[in-house]
C-alpha cells in the first residue's frame, strides 16, 4: 500500500490529526521535500545575522553577517568579528600580529613570514604585519653565467587550516 503522505508536496505536511490530508505549512515554517509529517521552523537571522534569503513554505531562510562580521561554519552558523589586516582575533578581541607574523585578511590568524633561506633565497622585500616577505633570487642565481630563467619556487603552504 502506498503511504498517503507521499502525495504531500513540498510546502505542506501530512496532517496526522486530520486523516493524513496535506495541510500547508503554517507561517514561519517550511518543508523542502514532499511526504513530510511536520514542517520545520524557519531559521531566524537575528543579532549579528542578517537575512540573505527569506524563508518560504518550501525553503529555509539563509543568513549572512552584518558588516564588521564574517560567516563561519556550514550555512553561516556563526558570525565572527572582523579584524584589520595585520591583526588576529583572540578571546580578548583583535590583537596586532606579533613580529615575524602577518595577516593580509580581515579574518583568520597571523601566519609566520616565509623563511626565504629555506629555499636558498634572499629577502627581497621585508615582511610587515600585513604582508609576507618577498623572496628574491638565490645568491647562486646572481652569479655570472647563471641561467637567466629559473623555475619559480614552489608556493609554501602556511601551517593553518583553510579559512
Amino acid at each position: 500500500l502506498q503511504d498517503p503522505c507521499s502525495n504531500c508536496p513540498a510546502g505542506t505536511f501530512c496532517d496526522n490529526n486530520r486523516n493524513q490530508i496535506c495541510s500547508p505549512c503554517p507561517p514561519n515554517s517550511f518543508s523542502s521535500a514532499g511526504g513530510q509529517r511536520t514542517c520545520d521552523i524557519c531559521r531566524q537571522c537575528k543579532g549579528v545575522f542578517r537575512t540573505r534569503k527569506e524563508c518560504s513554505s518550501t525553503s529555509n531562510a539563509e543568513c549572512d553577517c552584518t558588516p564588521g562580521f564574517h560567516c563561519l561554519g556550514a550555512g553561516c552558523s556563526m558570525c565572527e568579528q572582523d579584524c584589520k589586516q595585520g591583526q588576529e582575533l583572540t578571546k580578548k578581541g583583535c590583537k596586532d600580529c606579533c613580529f615575524g607574523t602577518f595577516n593580509d585578511q580581515k579574518r583568520g590568524i597571523c601566519r609566520p613570514w616565509t623563511n626565504c633561506s629555506l629555499d636558498g633565497k634572499s629577502v627581497l622585500v621585508n615582511g610587515t604585519k600585513e604582508r609576507d616577505v618577498v623572496c628574491g633570487p638565490s645568491p647562486a642565481d646572481l652569479s655570472p653565467g647563471a641561467s637567466s630563467v629559473t623555475p619559480p619556487a614552489p608556493a609554501r603552504e602556511p601551517g593553518h587550516s583553510p579559512q
Epitope: 505536511f13 501530512c14 496532517d15 496526522n16 490529526n17 486530520r18 495541510s23 505549512c25 503554517p26 514561519n28 515554517s29 521535500a33 513530510q36 509529517r37 511536520t38 514542517c39 520545520d40 521552523i41 524557519c42 531566524q44
Partner: antibody, heavy 121, light 106 residues
Amino acid sequence: QVQLQQSGAELARPGASVKMSCKASGYTFTFYTMHWLKQRPGQGLEWIGYINPSSGYTNYNQKFTDKATLTADKSSSTAYMQLSSLTSEDSAVYYCARSDGSSSKWYFDVWGTGTTVTVSS
Amino acid sequence: QIVLSQSPTILSASPGEKVTMTCRASSSVSYIHWYQQKPGSSPKAWISATSNLASGVPARFSGSGSGTSYSLTISRVEAEDAATYYCQQWSSNPFTFGSGTKLEIK
C-alpha cells in the same frame, strides 16, 4: 504507552562536555520532533532547540548555538544532546520533550524524565 | 524574543474556590500552551492552543484568551491542583515560557 526515558545524572568539571540521551518508545520516532529544554533549580523553562529525527534538521535558540549539539539515531529511536565548555551556569535539569509537528502548534505533549547536570570543580 | 509575564507569582486558594492566573505576552501571539509541574517531577502537558485540555486533565480547568492576554481558570480548586503552571508560546522563534504561577492550597 508513549515514554521518553532520559539518561542518568551527570557530574562534570568546568570546561568539560557531557552527552545525554533520550530514548523514545511507544510511537513512531520519525513522526514527531524532539525538543530539549533547560530548567535551573527553582527557575522556569528555557527552550534549547529541536531536531526533526526524520530529516536531521535542527533549529536552536540562538542563546544555545555554541553550547548544545542535537543529534538523533533513528535505528534506536534515541535523541542526544551534547553540552560543551561547561560552566556553573549549565548546572540544571535538562528535559527532552516530544512535539506533534502535525498540529503545527509546537506543543510539548510528552516530556522526558529529566537529566540532572551538575558542574563542579 | 517574545516575553511571557505570568501573574500572580504565587496564588493561594482554599479547596472549592475559583482561581484564575494570567499570562501576558510582550507582543501578540496566536495561541498559548499551558503545562503543570509538581516539585521533583517533569512538566506535564495541560492545555494546548489556548483552550484544549490535554488527555486526563479534569474539566474544572479551562483556558481562554487572545492577542497578548491569556488565562487559565480552575472552577473549583482541589488539593491535587497544587503545582506550578507555566505558559508557553511559539508565534515567534525562539519558544518562550512564562516564569510560572505557583498554586498553593490552604
